[in-house]
């Protein structure tokens, strides 16, 4: 079917449009374009005779039209009057004619709009403002933007006059924004410059800052007043009703108790004619003394002494506060406060009670803090530790032992070998040792202040031959899929290589096996029942080697899902029922039976003689491992038939 497509459909004045012809028939004599929806000689624009390739203008030809051999019509420099329908009349060679109609619409290129306002300085909660988008343009759509957003929904916003006028009723300060209007038609869109609405408001009730109303004698008083207002407010200060000055800030240096009183700020807006005031009452207090802490015991002994800390000076009707480590006091039965909070008692002090401690006196204005006090708690010595931890040494090496014990004041150290005093030092050094240096090495730590002493003894063996090692374990009965086990090869010896074997084989490669501590420790993660093997460790140096006795890992596991045997589920009446339950478990599980949910005996085997159809039902075996804390069960259905009714059934056990 012959059709006309207008490209574009909406055309801007001054631009061009192409009336594009689709499905033009073959064997044409000519074609003619007409303005309007019908063929009309009076409104012919142009005709075209194919044979002569001649274009002939008609009454409606304006000189802006060009007809193409494919019958399409280009209209240039479009004017408003070109809007409407266009009819193509196709004259076929057989003089059977065909027509098609197309159309387009012409719109002007819009000018840049502007906003006019009926009120340039509206007053808040009183005035309305009407913005009008200029100029008025036919067939244009008007849009409005507030702060580059589309209009919010508000009962105070009203569009009228075909959206050309935006009215804001009862303006508020929040309406102070950037307003733009936009004109649109199908061929163009233009936005106005922004208009800022200047809403007059206020003054609101002024706020006086800072908020504190209590001051110390000798301080400076600096009050600032602010009230939301447009235009900005003018400020006046009154003290006890007497005018002081017309400034936003009031400054009085070095105040005294006499400066106490009511301070009024008045804000005035000359445009709205409104006044608002706010009053604050200022109280000036005399300066209190700085507190300090006294102690009844400056060097208390740990776990023996109590300490009483007192906040000075004593002032009537005063609140005392305490802080430890810059925190408020923790709740502890060892901390006691006196009734007036002035004395803090620490019962049975520990080394962790050193502090710092602060006390404070609270007055009307603030809290005055004392300087911090630190307690010198005497403690120790704790059991000394001798390092390194080696107990076996080879002849010819140097023996260097160090002793340390936590202590305040620091401990004094003494060394004894086989009970004989050697030296009063923290370190013991013997060069080029021999077998004769084997023996008991004792470190003694002494605290001179508390008078306490503590000792630690270490056996040192000097030998070319390594001793037979042994394996220690951190978990003698690990649970499968839950626990880890760490085996350690003892003793720790200097310049020694540690080796491990499992069931007489070297260690398998496994992500669950990990060597550490110079291969001295073997850790098995997430043990399984398959890890219940013989573990041997070995030590060797350049002179000798030795192996431990095997240690078998006892892995607790199960119980697994039990199995009931025999597997038969059908029995003849009169047969014996002999069911045995078994579950893999370490240690062996406890067994119990239930028939049709009713508890039976706590045995591994369930025996019922001469069963009858009354013994039909569900037979459940329950297993429990007390060591792993795990349980399991299985249910079996048993059917008993009257004798001879079902051939091929089991006769029972």
């Amino acid at each position: 079917k012959l059709t006309i497509e207008s490209t574009p459909f909406n055309v801007a004045e001054g631009k061009e449009v192409l009336l594009l012809v689709h499905n033009l028939p073959q064997h044409l004599f000519g074609y003619s374009w007409y303005k309007g929806e019908r063929v009309d000689g009076n409104r012919q624009i142009i005709g075209y005779v194919i044979g002569t390739q001649q274009a002939t203008p008609g009454p409606a030809y304006s000189g802006r039209e060009i007809i193409y051999p494919n019958a399409s019509l280009l209209i240039q420099n479009i004017i408003q009057n070109d809007t409407g329908f266009y009819t193509l009349h196709v004259i076929k060679s057989d003089l059977v004619n065909e027509e098609a109609t197309g159309q387009f619409r012409v719109y002007p290129e819009l000018p840049k709009p502007s906003i006019s306002s009926n009120n340039s300085k509206p007053v808040e909660d009183k005035d309305a403002v009407a913005f009008t988008c200029e100029p008025e343009t036919q067939d244009a759509t008007y849009l409005w933007w507030v702060n580059n957003q589309s209009l919010p929904v508000s009962p105070r916003l009203q569009l009228s006059n075909g959206n050309r006028t935006l009215t804001l009723f009862n303006v508020t300060r929040n309406d102070t924004a950037s307003y733009k209007c936009e004109t649109q038609n199908p061929v163009s869109a233009r936005r106005s410059d922004s208009v800022i609405l200047n809403v007059l408001y206020g003054p609101d009730a002024p706020t006086i800052s800072p908020l504190n109303t209590s001051y110390r004698s000798g301080e400076n008083l600096n009050l600032s007043c602010h009230a939301a207002s447009n235009p900005p407010a003018q400020y006046s200060w009154f003290v006890n009703g007497t005018f002081q000055q017309s400034t936003q800030e009031l400054f009085i240096p070095n105040i005294t108790v006499n400066n106490s009183g009511s301070y009024t700020c008045q804000a005035h807006n000359s445009d709205t004619g409104l006044n608002r005031t706010t009053v604050t009452t200022i109280t000036v207090y005399a300066e209190p003394p700085k507190p300090f802490i006294t102690s009844n015991n400056s060097n208390p002994v740990e776990d023996e002494d109590a300490v009483a800390l007192t906040c000075e000076p004593e002032i009537q009707n005063t609140t005392y506060l305490w802080w430890v480590n810059n925190q408020s006091l923790p709740v502890s039965p060892r901390l006691q406060l006196s009734n007036d909070n002035r004395t803090l008692t620490l019962l049975s002090v520990t080394r962790n009670d050193v502090g710092p401690y602060e006390c404070g006196i609270q007055n009307e204005l603030s809290v005055d803090h004392s300087d911090p006090v630190i307690l010198n708690v005497l403690y120790g010595p704790d059991d000394p530790t001798i390092s390194p931890s080696y107990t076996y040494y080879r002849p010819g090496v140097n023996l260097s032992l160090s002793c340390h014990a936590a202590s305040n004041p620091p401990a004094q150290y003494s060394w004894l070998i086989d009970g004989n005093i050697q030296q009063h030092t923290q370190e013991l050094f013997i060069s080029n040792i021999t077998e004769k240096n084997s023996g008991l090495y004792t470190c003694q730590a002494n605290n001179s202040a508390s008078g306490h002493s503590r000792t630690t003894v270490k056996t040192i063996t000097v030998s070319a031959e390594l001793p037979k090692p042994s394996i220690s374990s951190n978990n003698s009965k690990p649970v499968e899929d839950k626990d880890a086990v760490a085996f350690t090869c003892e003793p720790e010896a200097q310049n020694t290589t540690y080796l491990w074997w499992v069931n007489g084989q070297s260690l398998p490669v496994s992500p669950r096996l990990q060597l550490s501590n110079g291969n001295r420790t073997l850790t098995l993660f997430n043990v399984t029942r398959n890890d219940a093997r013989a573990y041997v460790c070995g030590i060797q140096n350049s002179v000798s080697a030795n192996r431990s006795d095997p240690v078998t890992l006892d892995v607790l596991y199960g119980p697994d899902t039990p199995i009931i045997s025999p597997p038969d589920s059908s029995y003849l009446s009169g047969a014996n029922l002999n069911l045995s339950c078994h579950s893999a478990s370490n240690p062996s599980p406890q067994y119990s039976w239930r028939i049709n949910g009713i508890p039976q005996q706590h045995t591994q085997v369930l025996f019922i003689a001469k069963i009858t159809p009354n013994n039909n039902g569900t037979y459940a075996c329950f297993v429990s491992n007390l060591a792993t804390g795990r349980n399991n069960s299985i249910v079996k259905s048993i059917t008993v038939s009257a004798s001879g009714t079902s051939p091929g059934l089991s006769a029972g056990a």
């Epitope: 019908r38 063929v39 030809y61």
Partner: antibody, heavy 116, light 106 residues
Framework: QVQLQQPGAELVKPGASVKVSCKAS????????MHWVKQRPGQGLEWIGR????????NYNQKFKGKATLTVDKSSSTAYMQLSSLTSEDSAVYYC?????????WGQGTTLTVSS | DIVMTQSQKFMSTSVGDRVSVTCKAS??????VAWYQQKPGQSPKALIY???YRYSGVPDRFTGSGSGTDFTLTISNVQSEDLAEYFC????????FGAGTKLELK
């Protein structure tokens, strides 16, 4: 083949009315204006008016307003011209015609005689 | 209304002659003019459209020219079958015909 068939002659008394028919065939009747033209003996051609069969839109020569009334019957593809209050001045040959660019067809004409 | 004036009611010619029939419009009609030929007892027949373009089947001895207000139909090498009445017609604003020019033998 475009054809416009008109009756050859009509004899009418003065003061009466006459309705001249024009049956169209061979084209889409509703696509083109149907024109009516008057030619008095020995005189030139005078355009009476036109009607568009699609919506019966009409245009008349000012001179024939009130004299001629143009109508169509789409179902029979026939155009009519009714002439009223006839006088001897109305005696003439009346043609129906399709007069468009590259598309010009005339009926054979109906001779109207107004005589008592 | 636009008036089309054909000033010569009759024109005499001989076979083989060249003759020009003129027509004047009362206002500018561009090139929106057609020429018709009518023989006695027949309906008019269109010869020329758009002032200068021949209808299909019209012999090329018929030529139209002019624009605006002055238009001419020229018949070169007049044949006996060309002896007929010739009308101009404007279709710029509705339709009006000229009074006609009759071509006859000397």
């Amino acid at each position: 083949q475009v054809q416009l068939q008109q009756p050859g002659a009509e004899l009418v008394k003065p003061g009466a009315s006459v309705k001249v028919s024009c049956k169209a065939s061979g084209y889409t009747f509703t696509s083109y204006w149907m024109h009516w033209v008057k030619q008095r003996p020995g005189q030139g051609l005078e355009w009476i008016g036109r009607i568009h069969p699609s919506d019966s839109d009409t245009n008349y020569n000012q001179k024939f307003k009130g004299k001629a009334t143009l109508t169509v019957d789409k179902s029979s593809s026939t155009a009519y011209m009714q002439l009223s209050s006839l006088t001897s001045e109305d005696s003439a040959v009346y043609y129906c015609a399709i007069v468009e660019w590259m598309f010009d067809y005339w009926g054979q004409g109906t001779t109207l005689t107004v005589s008592s | 209304d636009i008036v089309m004036t054909q000033s010569q009611k009759f024109m005499s010619t001989s076979v083989g002659d060249r003759v020009s029939v003129t027509c004047k419009a009362s206002q500018n009609v561009g090139t929106n003019v057609a020429w018709y030929q009518q023989k006695p007892g027949q309906s008019p027949k269109a010869l020329i459209y758009s002032a200068s373009y021949r209808y299909s089947g019209v012999p090329d001895r018929f030529t139209g020219s002019g624009s605006g207000t002055d238009f001419t139909l020229t018949i070169s090498n007049v044949q006996s079958e060309d002896l007929a009445e010739y009308f101009c017609q404007q279709y710029y604003s509705y339709f009006t015909f000229g009074a006609g020019t009759k071509l006859e033998l000397k």
